[in-house]
């Protein structure tokens, strides 16, 4: 492990589209990638009428807008999915949204995802 | 191993439209993004955009903004890029390549644009 | 975001090495180590053979090599081959809050 990083083998893994997709529901995704490459989890939810949907969490491949976030936080202003990711293991976890763009303190609070 | 497998060559009219395919395989196809390059007869290769494939979430390139849509259909594991008002500078080989660093590229689709 | 410039061609001997520069500015190569180089030969699409600057990608030879200075990356290729004749080109990551841009592209003939 690279000091100062934080190295991602492991990620939560959920899909709510799973039965479409063919996938399992949820559960621990080992995320595996080239070497030289670095590994991150994402989530991705609705926001719909203040009712937080999970869509799916899970591995991310290298994306440098994912380098050195510990926390999963989307930064985009009202998104129509929202999406995050991270680094470390099963950052994706804890999820929130925190835009950028807002001149006033955001009132955002960390979403701690419960299946439906 | 991974595969991005694209639609076949297409002919259009001026003013038309073309809608390219890029069928991914050898990974999860929602662990990162779709992006869309083109190289015209001849020249250099030129970024269109890119589509976050879990999310949807898009990003064009200003030249093609108002013409260029990109979607995505997860179940199928499939990146569309749809071209609209074409024309004939337009004709080139479109290719779609996964992730940030286009670590993979497809075969790409010629698309020829002549009346 | 603007392209980046690279030279339109360059030529070497098999054996010699030859270096392929990509120019930016401060805010895209000079900023970020985020710069990628692809090798394209005629008819073929792209392949990635370095990211971020200097990681090469797996299966690619070590005779090549990236590296960056201040606005300008550069691509260099030892022991020159007669199939690395081909069309070199620069670019930036590109997803999310990111654009992507290439270089011109240059053609590396082998003399």
């Known amino acids: 492990a690279i000091l100062g990083r934080s190295e991602t083998q492991e990620c939560l893994f959920f899909n709510a589209n799973w039965e479409k997709d063919r996938t399992n529901q949820t559960g621990v995704e080992p995320c595996y990638g080239d070497k030289d490459k670095r590994r991150h989890c994402f989530a991705t939810w609705k926001n719909i009428s203040g009712s937080i949907e999970i869509v799916k969490q899970g591995c991310w491949l290298d994306d440098i807008n994912c380098y050195d976030r510990t926390d999963c936080v989307e930064k985009k202003d009202s998104p129509e999915v929202y999406f995050c990711c991270c680094e470390g293991n099963m950052c994706n976890e804890k999820f929130s949204y925190f835009p950028e763009m807002e001149v006033t303190q955001p009132t955002s609070n960390p979403v701690t995802p419960k299946p439906p | 191993q991974v595969q991005l497998v694209q639609s076949g060559a297409e002919v259009k009219k001026p003013g038309a439209s073309v809608k390219v395919s890029c069928k991914a395989s050898g990974y999860t196809f929602t662990s990162s993004y779709i992006n869309w390059v083109r190289q015209a007869p001849g020249q250099g290769l030129e970024w269109m955009g890119t589509?976050?494939?879990?999310?949807?979430?898009?990003s064009y390139a200003q030249k093609f903004q108002g013409r260029v849509t990109m979607t995505r259909d997860t179940s199928i594991s499939t990146a569309y890029m749809e071209l609209s008002r074409l024309r004939s500078d337009d004709t080139a080989v479109y290719y779609c390549a996964r992730g940030g660093w286009f670590d993979y590229w497809g075969q790409g689709t010629l698309v020829t644009v002549s009346s | 975001q603007s392209a980046l410039t690279q030279p339109a061609s360059v030529s070497g001997s098999p054996g010699q090495s030859i270096t392929i520069s990509c120019t930016g500015t401060s805010s895209d190569v000079g900023s970020y180590d985020y710069v990628n180089w692809y090798q394209q030969h005629p008819g073929k699409a792209p392949k990635l053979m370095i990211h971020?600057?200097?990681k090469r990608e797996s299966g690619v030879s070590n005779r090549f090599s990236g590296s960056k200075s201040g606005n300008t990356a550069s691509l260099t290729i030892s022991g020159l081959q007669a199939e690395d004749e081909a069309d070199y080109y620069c670019g930036t990551f590109a997803g999310g809050s990111y654009y992507g841009v290439f270089g011109g592209g240059t053609k590396l003939t082998v003399l």
């Open positions: 971020g600057v200097s």
């Open positions: 589509i976050n494939a879990v999310s949807g979430s898009t």
